[in-house]
């Protein structure tokens, strides 16, 4: 058993049929010595008396808010949560496996630039009685500070018969140099509590590996005389690290109709303009990627060919 | 400790091309190592990230773009003295700071070159003959060093009398390649910045 936060404790349980469970001793936070009784949740049934209560925690029915009273007055609370371990593996029931970039990916993180600011998100099908708390650091043995905000519900989607909820959090490394060469990864730890179930999820990454620039901005077209060709130009996204001559991007320019199966024109360039062949009912799209360290491409920025 | 804005004309900056070749070569070599050594811990997640130039050179700090010198997190107190002549400089107006930066890059390359050559000598003794360093990568390191054209003491190639542990050598190769790729990215960014300034 360990303390998650004040008056909230996590009991780690090996979860299998007829498991013996864990013996837990609760102590009432009071100078009083006599006339103390214990109850669980809303029940008025007295579980025991005395300053300490010893319980055997085996299942979710044994978890919950234990309260010690004296003469009708509440003295203190202890909330017990369960963390299940099945076949040596901690449960991951609360969050959905996003399976990208690999199986058992519960947290996904992205950064728009090298400033040390990043966003992580996760998915769940649970809609109520759910809380998250996020901590982060650079490295684990001698951790350096990363400050994370509160996790918020950022999107709701319908997937078949289920509703899916996306939560996200923004974090900022306390003293980040955009030009630095990372040797210690960022560690992100998410505590998830659903009702009386506790789970924790972690992710470890270098900012350089989670870079995904915003799409290029200000796409403009200029038809070329006596030609099917069009000059398309754009600018670096505002959120990208500066100076741009140091943090350079490379671009992919594509002309395609509405269907992905349609024919297309595609060209890669380090410049902020390119010449392509425009077709009726097609769109010109441009996306960006770090020129020197190939992490993710940005989403497409598009304009119609017409 | 930063790069000035007044730097050589773009056409006068021969190191940019060499640095692009360097990044390409080390990226290809790293990819080859990951594929060949698939049963060894050779991915970014599996290896310890070590920097053999730590406390010996200060390329990131010496080559910091002017725009980032206002960022206190980028200013490290490490001081290193460098030799200050070089053919990539191509302009008499080139400042001492830029010479310091290019000299630091040269020292990085020299250190990695020695490590890689020592390692290749060990790998050539491996009866499995599983992996060797790409000669193209070694040649590209050499070309960039020649383009930088700094005079410095020759670092003797490390020789070891004991029987090499090939497993450890291959893991060290992965560690070195990952670190060198990161440094090659920095070098490419620096050259691009200097070329554009």
């Amino acid at each position: 058993i360990w303390e998650l936060k004040k008056d909230v404790y996590v009991v780690e349980l090996d979860w299998y049929p007829d498991a013996p469970g864990e013996m837990v001793v609760l102590t009432c936070d009071t100078p009083e010595e006599d006339g103390i009784t214990w109850t669980l949740d809303q029940s008025s049934e007295v579980l025991g008396s005395g300053k300490t209560l010893t319980i055997q925690v085996k299942e979710f029915g044994d978890a919950g808010q234990y309260t010690c009273h004296k003469g009708g007055e509440v003295l203190s609370h202890s909330l017990l949560l369960l963390h299940k371990k099945e076949d040596g593996i901690w449960s991951t029931d609360i969050l959905k496996d996003q399976k990208e970039p690999k199986n058992k990916t519960f947290l996904r993180c992205e950064a728009k630039n090298y400033s040390g600011r990043f966003t992580c998100w996760w998915l769940t099908t649970i809609s109520t009685d759910l809380t998250f708390s996020v901590k982060s650091s650079r490295g684990s043995s001698d951790p350096q500070g990363v400050t994370c905000g509160a996790a918020t519900l950022s999107a709701e989607r319908v997937r078949g018969d289920n509703k899916e909820y996306e939560y996200s959090v923004e974090c900022q490394e306390d003293s980040a140099c955009p030009a630095a060469e990372e040797s210690l990864p960022i560690e992100v730890m998410v505590d998830a509590v659903h009702k009386l179930k506790y789970e924790n999820y972690t992710s470890s990454f270098f900012i350089r590996d989670i870079i995904k620039p915003d799409p290029p901005k200000n796409l403009q077209l200029k038809p070329l005389k006596n030609s099917r060709q069009v000059e398309v130009s754009w600018e670096y996204p505002d959120t990208w690290s500066t100076p741009h001559s140091y943090f350079s991007l490379t671009f992919c320019v594509q002309v395609q109709g509405k269907s992905k199966r349609e024919k297309k024109d595609r060209v890669f360039t380090d410049k902020t303009s390119a010449t392509v062949i425009c077709r009726k009912n097609a769109s010109i799209s441009v996306r960006a990627q770090d020129r020197y360290y190939s992490s993710s491409w940005s989403e497409w920025a598009s304009v119609p060919c017409s | 400790r930063n790069l000035p804005v007044a730097t050589p004309d773009p056409g006068m900056f021969p190191c940019l091309h060499h640095s692009q070749n360097l990044l390409r070569a080390v990226s290809n070599m790293l990819q080859k190592a990951r594929q060949t050594l698939e049963f060894y811990p050779c991915t970014s997640e599996e290896i310890d990230h070590e920097d053999i130039t730590k406390d010996k050179t200060s390329t990131v700090e010496a080559c910091l773009p002017l725009e980032l010198t206002k960022n206190e997190s980028c200013l490290n107190s490490r001081e290193t003295s460098f030799i200050t002549n070089g053919s990539c400089l191509a302009s008499r107006k080139t400042s001492f700071m830029m010479a310091l930066c290019l000299s630091s890059i040269y020292e990085d390359l020299k250190m990695y070159q020695v490590e890689f050559k020592t390692m290749n000598a060990k790998l050539l003794m491996d009866p499995k003959r599983q992996i060797f360093l790409d000669q193209n990568m070694l040649a590209v390191i050499d070309e960039l060093m020649q383009a930088l054209n700094f005079n410095s003491e020759t670092v003797p190639q490390k020789s070891s009398l004991e029987e090499p542990d090939f497993y450890k050598t291959k893991i060290k190769l992965c560690i070195l390649l990952h670190a060198f790729r990161i440094r090659a990215v920095t070098i490419d960014r620096v050259m691009s910045y200097l070329n554009a300034s």
Epitope: R228, Q229, T250, R261, E262, K263, K264, D265, R266, V267, F268, T269, D270, T275, I277, R279, K280 | -
Partner: antibody, heavy 118, light 107 residues
Framework: QVQLVQSGAEVKKPGSSVKVSCKAS????????LHWVRQAPGQGLEWMGW????????EYAPKFQGRVTITADESTSTAYMELSSLRSEDTAVYYC???????????WGQGTLVTVSS | DIVMTQSPLSLPVTPGEPASISCRAS??????LHWYQQKPGQAPRLLIY???QSISGVPSRFSGSGSGTDFTLTISSLQPEDFATYMC?????????FGQGTKVEIK
Amino acid sequence: QVQLVQSGAEVKKPGSSVKVSCKASGGTFSDYYLHWVRQAPGQGLEWMGWIDPENGDTEYAPKFQGRVTITADESTSTAYMELSSLRSEDTAVYYCARNKELRYFDVWGQGTLVTVSS
Amino acid sequence: DIVMTQSPLSLPVTPGEPASISCRASQSISINLHWYQQKPGQAPRLLIYFASQSISGVPSRFSGSGSGTDFTLTISSLQPEDFATYMCQQSNSFPLTFGQGTKVEIK
């Protein structure tokens, strides 16, 4: 299986014209760009131009502008390349090639040898 | 027009040995570079597109690398059926242009 089948070899006099055909099978004809590329004996490849069979749009290499005409007949899934004012240096194997991507070629015809000789 | 220069023009290789062919562009073409194989009396066959992207059905011993002006096609271990002429092609701008070809011959 996508295939491009070209017309047979031709022998032409200098100053005359030649029209080579390229019939496509497998896949929808208008879903691909169609190009013509030639190769003189013992030489490298030389791109001549492309057509979008969907709308008849064409683009030619400046070297052949005014001398080459590429057309397409959607009803027969056939593309044509006509080269006029032939000279001896136009002796080459002419290939048609296609792709859903405009700028490179993933399926080629077998080639048509055009010999220009007086 | 962008000029593509291949080297060497002829490359004698022992079967089973690796081979590398270089292609250089007269100006930067990013990764807009494609590789073809051609055997005598046959049409070219696409091997690699956009400098390093492999084609399904093409053996994995063929790989491409490079960007900007310098590109390489590598055959990790030459098989008897690989003796042919290899050409690079740029797609950075029209007109599309090809390298003059490298003939890989049996040593």
